[in-house]
């Protein structure tokens, strides 16, 4: 078996990739600068901490993560790392051109940095769905496709709907979900005889994968916490996710031993159960006024995504052609969705508890942005898996689905690698 | 007592460069986000710059955007606003402010500038 | 968004009920501050989040409204209460807008 990249992406995607650094590189020339004022350097070391929490979620919780099919978990992580360093960079100028463009040259800080990690990250949740199935020009297409539609989103929701940074960055989840959920849909789904060993996780890259859980169940409340304006929101924030997270573990690994008809534990499963507690929590992280309630919210959101594991990979797999280990898409899909209703339900309460009319406006506003947030996520991930379709990528065969080899040079050449 | 005072404040010529302090006293600094507010002689008031509280992030109104800078050391409990090719149309007395993040209902914040300075005067004049 | 204020100059008793109003070009839910200032004197936060009383402002002084229509009563007018008020919406993206103020008087 020939590990040769196929002739023709060997030319593509080098031209492809460096053109396009070459092209960002000349727009961060042209347009951007640092910031200049003089900060506090010990408060500067905090904030850049921040970012650093959300780089090693990116690059070591969410590469890690989607390492755990037999052959192809080198170009999981490494393919993350890829579309992490490129969408950062058209992150970081897409943010500037939207929001700062009008005044002149676009100012580089640290919170521009984090929020370019954070739309970066969507791509990385999406990508779940398609890895495996796709070449890094193609890749390097989806990574365009997305941050723009997002940070368009981003930028529109705020206009229209006026809600903080926090808020708009929190429909990621479902944004994510459903881009990726709906590329996956455009691109070929039959698996061919003979290629089904390859979509099966195996004993380390599942451990390589559990590793990559851990990282983002230890940083997911840095991850919720990012953007808020505020300390004491901040606090509340990492407190709630923490909890939430503490008890989806719990949940998930109980769950999935419930779930099992010997009671044995499913590395699967507990690979994102573990993290639903802090998609679920994410959106009214800094709204939920005591833990109970975070703890409750982390125990439904753990048991729906054990559930969901179990009884959603079959229809994901027919329909998306979804390998039963990549369950992010379809995980976060459901768990956004409950962030989404929590965080209307507090709305509500809140609302209420104030003596202040207009709940309805509240919610139709909330509800309104939700619905923008999934239209314009599948919309954009259906023009994306249009784009990926395209002959001139050399998309992988489907034979080579789930395989190392068609990208990486091994000194042997050996299967079981 | 909570306090604020402003200072730097003085007479200058147009295109020159000047540069406020705001210093802060009786409360934790680096916990809030800090304003710059203006008010021309005989007008209204005018948001000019804000700073999130670890100073990871700036606003500016944008008749200043590339022109002044907004900047904090919460070690040493003070708010700057770094004034660069100034214009008649700058004169001002310019204010800091604290913004406070204050609970309404259940557990929804809101916004505020609850504390402020007293002013510095910065006049533009040639 | 936008602030506008109505009336710009308003002629009042002591005693007398006033309303001034505040309307926003879009709507900026409750992220609506209220303050008092008076001549060679910084600005005084009388109400926040729309309706809500700031902690030692007397109970005469009190806010509604949401969205983009927005008021401040003063239900009884005292001699320390002749000033200019403004409304600044403290919503989640700059610019945090000011209204032009009201001047209330002594008629």
């Known amino acids: 078996m020939s590990s040769k990249y196929p002739r023709s992406v060997r030319r593509c995607l080098p031209l492809w990739a460096l053109t396009l650094e070459a092209a960002l590189i000349l727009l961060f020339y042209f347009f951007t600068h640092y910031d200049a004022s003089l900060e506090d350097q010990k408060g500067l070391v905090a904030s850049y901490q921040v970012g650093q929490d959300l780089t090693v979620m990116a690059a070591i919780g969410l590469g890690f993560l989607t390492s755990s099919f037999r052959r192809h978990s080198w170009s999981s992580v490494a393919f993350n790392l890829f579309m992490l360093a490129l969408g950062v960079q058209w992150a970081i100028l897409l943010d500037g051109f939207l929001s700062q463009f009008p005044s002149g040259k676009v100012v580089i800080t640290l919170f521009s940095i984090r929020l370019a990690t954070m739309s970066a990250l969507s791509v990385l949740i999406s990508v779940d769905a398609v890895l495996g199935k796709v070449n890094l020009a193609q890749l390097v297409v989806m990574v365009l496709v997305e941050v723009t539609a997002l940070g368009n989103l981003r930028m529109v929701i705020s206009n229209i709907f006026n809600t903080d940074y926090h808020m708009n960055m929190m429909h990621i989840y479902v944004f994510a979900a459903y881009f990726g959920l709906s590329v996956a849909w455009c691109l070929p789904k039959p698996l061919p005889e003979g290629t089904e060993d390859k979509d099966q996780t195996a004993t380390i890259p599942s451990l390589s994968a559990m590793l990559g859980a851990l990282f983002l169940w230890m940083f997911w409340p840095s991850f919720n916490s990012a953007l808020l304006r505020s300390p004491i929101e901040r606090k509340n924030a990492v407190f709630n996710t923490y909890y939430a997270v503490a008890v989806s573990v719990v949940t998930a690994i109980s769950g999935s031993s419930l779930a099992h008809p010997q009671g044995k534990i499913s590395k699967t499963y507990v690979h994102s159960a573990v993290l639903a507690g802090g998609v679920a929590v994410g959106t009214s992280c800094h709204l939920i006024p005591s833990p109970w309630l975070a703890m409750v919210l982390g125990l439904v959101a753990g048991l729906i995504s054990v559930g969901g594991a179990k009884y959603l990979p079959g229809c994901c797999n027919r329909v998306l052609g979804i390998p039963h280990s990549s369950i992010m898409g379809y995980n976060f899909s459901l768990l956004g969705l409950l962030g989404e209703i929590i965080y209307i339900v507090l709305l509500v309460l809140d609302t209420v508890g104030a003596g202040n009319g207009m709940i309805g406006f509240q919610v139709l506003l909330s509800i309104g942005e939700l619905s923008l947030a999934i239209v314009i996520a599948l919309m954009s991930g259906l023009l994306t898996g249009l784009l990926l379709n395209l002959k001139i990528w050399k998309a992988p065969h489907e034979a080579k689905y789930f395989d190392d080899q068609v990208f990486w040079k091994f000194p042997h050449l050996a299967v079981g690698f | 007592e909570v306090q604020l005072l402003e200072s730097g404040g003085g007479v200058v010529q147009p295109g020159r460069s000047l540069r406020l302090a705001c210093a802060a006293s009786g409360f934790s600094f680096r916990s809030y986000g800090m304003h710059w507010v203006r008010q021309a002689p005989g007008r209204g008031l005018e948001w000019v710059a804000f700073?999130?509280?670890?100073?990871?992030?700036?606003y500016y109104v944008d008749s200043v955007k590339g022109r002044f800078t907004i900047s904090r050391d919460n070690s040493k409990n003070t708010l700057y606003l770094e004034m660069n090719s100034l214009r008649v149309d700058d004169t001002a007395v310019y204010y800091c402010?604290?913004?406070?993040?204050?609970?309404?209902?259940?557990?929804?914040?809101?916004?505020?500038?609850?504390?402020w300075g007293p002013g510095t005067t910065v006049t533009v004049s040639s | 968004a936008e602030l506008t204020q109505s009336p710009s100059f308003l002629s009042a008793s002591v005693g007398d009920r006033v309303t001034i109003t505040c309307r926003a070009s879009?709507?900026?839910?409750?992220?609506l501050a209220w303050y008092q200032q008076k001549p060679g004197k910084a600005p005084k936060l009388l109400i926040y989040?729309?309706?809500t009383l700031q902690s030692g402002v007397p109970s005469r002084f009190s806010g509604s409204g949401s969205g983009t229509e927005f008021t401040l009563t003063i239900s009884s007018l005292q001699p320390e209460d002749f000033a200019t008020y403004y409304c600044?919406?403290?919503?989640?993206?700059?610019?945090?807008?000011f209204g032009p103020g009201t001047k209330v008087d002594i008629k």
């Open positions: 600044q919406q403290l919503n989640n993206y700059p610019p945090f807008t």
């Open positions: 700073t999130w509280f670890d100073g990871s992030n700036k």
């Open positions: 989040a729309a309706s």
């Open positions: 402010a604290r913004e406070a993040s204050m609970l309404r209902g259940i557990s929804r914040y809101y916004y505020a500038m609850d504390v």
């Open positions: 879009q709507g900026i839910r409750s992220y």
